[in-house]
């Protein structure tokens, strides 16, 4: 007899979730020599332990601590790239600029990128039918708490000059409610981080505005400055050219002349 299962508003766990996490872990540790010591079965067990048998609206950051401990990784100073609502370009950038890292270039971020998961209270089953939606159901769900936890940790360990890519096409270029605005900004450590440099990505050729003067960017500058971290901002008017010049920095068309 099928058991009664709570119906949530969000989509269910990504199909083949355990296999996907395990396969990603194996792939990551093969490609990154500094993480070869990681036991992927232990990583999966810690991941599973964070949400299996737990009420999916009552997940805490504490639940993910065993996983965070296993996935401990450091980014060299000046090499952290944060992003907000412009994930694809940020990832295209770090795929080319291999010495810079987004959260999704780190083991834990790589494992969970684009995946959804949740369990059920008092059963060992994974819920493939539905999972809590952040707005409609609850914010303390397995996925949201995971990203909050690893984002906090990622920001806390950053040092030197930290970069952030922001979407200039959004009405709120800097959104205090985004993961960057609500978690990462507040967890940069002033004693380790000298500056935050924002790259505001423009959406089209018609947009000649200096988006670094946008009120939300000024708000970000204020928050950062109050935390004794210097703030810089740069317009990226042409993201296609930006990526091209990252790939081909010596090309004459990439040397400042305009």
């Amino acid at each position: 007899v099928p058991r009664w299962r709570q119906q949530w508003s969000g989509s269910g766990t990504t199909s083949r979730f355990p296999e996907t996490v395990l396969a990603r872990c194996v792939k990551y540790t093969e490609v990154h020599p500094e993480m070869r010591h990681v036991d992927c079965q232990s990583v999966w067990d810690a991941f599973k332990g964070a949400f299996i048998s737990k009420y999916p609206c009552n997940i805490t950051e504490e639940d993910y601590q065993p996983l965070v401990k296993l996935g401990t990784q450091t980014v060299p100073c000046n090499k952290t790239l944060l992003w907000s609502r412009i994930k694809d370009l940020a990832h295209q950038f770090t795929q080319v600029q291999r010495d810079m890292f987004t959260l999704e270039d780190m083991l834990l971020g790589y494992l969970a990128d684009d995946l959804t998961w949740c369990g059920e209270f008092n059963t060992f089953e994974i819920n493939y039918q539905s999972c809590p939606d952040w707005r409609k159901d609850c914010s303390n769900n397995p996925v949201s708490v995971f990203w909050k936890t690893v984002s906090r940790r990622f920001a806390e360990t950053a040092c030197g000059v930290v970069h952030v890519m922001l979407n200039g096409s959004r009405s709120k270029i800097f959104d205090k409610n985004s993961t960057f605005g609500s978690v990462e900004v507040h967890n940069l450590q002033p004693e380790k981080v000298q500056a935050l440099e924002a790259w505001v990505i423009h959406g089209g050729r018609e947009d000649s505005r200096d988006l670094c003067q946008d009120p939300t960017i000024k708000e970000l500058e204020s928050i950062i400055s109050k935390r004794n971290i210097r703030f810089f901002c740069k317009n990226i008017y042409r993201p296609d050219k930006f990526l091209q010049c990252v790939k081909n920095p010596e090309d004459s068309s990439c040397l400042s002349g305009i």
């Epitope: 008017y237 050219k241 091209q244």
Partner: antibody, heavy 123, light 107 residues
């Protein structure tokens, strides 16, 4: 040496179509925005259309919007302008021009031009 | 769109003399202005960009100045090959726009 060579111009009746080509050489074609600029006989320069590095963004002057289509083939180092529903006022020499673009600086000029191809729209 | 107005329409100058061409924008274009030279039957040639930077291979007798809405192209000592039509172009706001041109002719 940077070279831009236009072709495809000629005499066409009003309402007709024409496809212009511009063969580029001497530089990495995909690293530059490209534009078409026209010049009616005895008149000044008028920007017509532009295309981004990979052809995913296209822009048109109001006077040609909906009638002209710009495109590029980076594998062939060639820029195109498909001109439909031609009018007498489209009669001009059409130049293809290269735009050096910077990612962190808005706007650009035309640093190299082709010799142009004459399009005459007349019955 | 930004309207570019050049003056005078025609400038008559003797070889060896100084020529001063003006270009006015209907609104500020900062320093995002280029100057081109066009001789009969030829394509335009870039002379100046960024209002004052000479393009590669352009002789020092050509100089540009100005910012905002008022710009000047100066040819310090006109040579025979300088008699041509000169156009300004703004690239501060989309779409890019040209002035109507100034013809520099032999006096």
């Amino acid at each position: 040496e940077v070279q831009l060579l236009e072709s495809g111009g000629g005499l066409v009746q009003p309402g007709g179509s024409l496809r212009l080509s511009c063969a580029a050489s001497g530089f990495t074609f995909s690293f530059y925005d490209m534009s078409w600029v026209r010049q009616a006989p005895g008149k000044g320069l008028e920007w017509v259309s532009a295309v981004s590095l990979y052809g995913d963004e296209t822009y048109y002057a109001d006077s040609v919007k909906g009638r002209f289509t710009i495109s590029r083939d980076n594998s062939k180092n060639t820029l195109y302008l498909q001109m439909n529903s031609l009018r007498a006022e489209d009669t001009a020499v059409y130049y293809c021009a290269r735009e050096p673009v910077s990612y962190d600086y808005y706007g650009s000029y035309f640093d190299y031009w082709g010799q142009g191809t004459l399009v005459t729209v007349s019955s | 769109e930004i309207v570019m107005t050049q003056s005078p329409a025609t400038l008559s100058v003797s070889p060896g003399e100084r020529a001063t061409l003006s270009c006015r924008a209907s609104q500020s274009v900062s320093s995002n202005l280029a100057w081109y030279q066009q001789k009969p039957g030829q394509a335009p040639r870039l002379l100046i960009y960024g209002a004052s930077t000479r393009a590669t291979g352009i002789p020092a007798r050509f100089s540009g100045s100005g910012s905002g809405t008022e710009f000047t192209l100066t040819i310090s000592s006109l040579q025979s090959e300088d008699f041509a039509v000169y156009y300004c172009q703004q690239y501060n706001n989309w779409p890019w726009t040209f002035g109507q041109g100034t013809k520099v002719e032999i006096k």
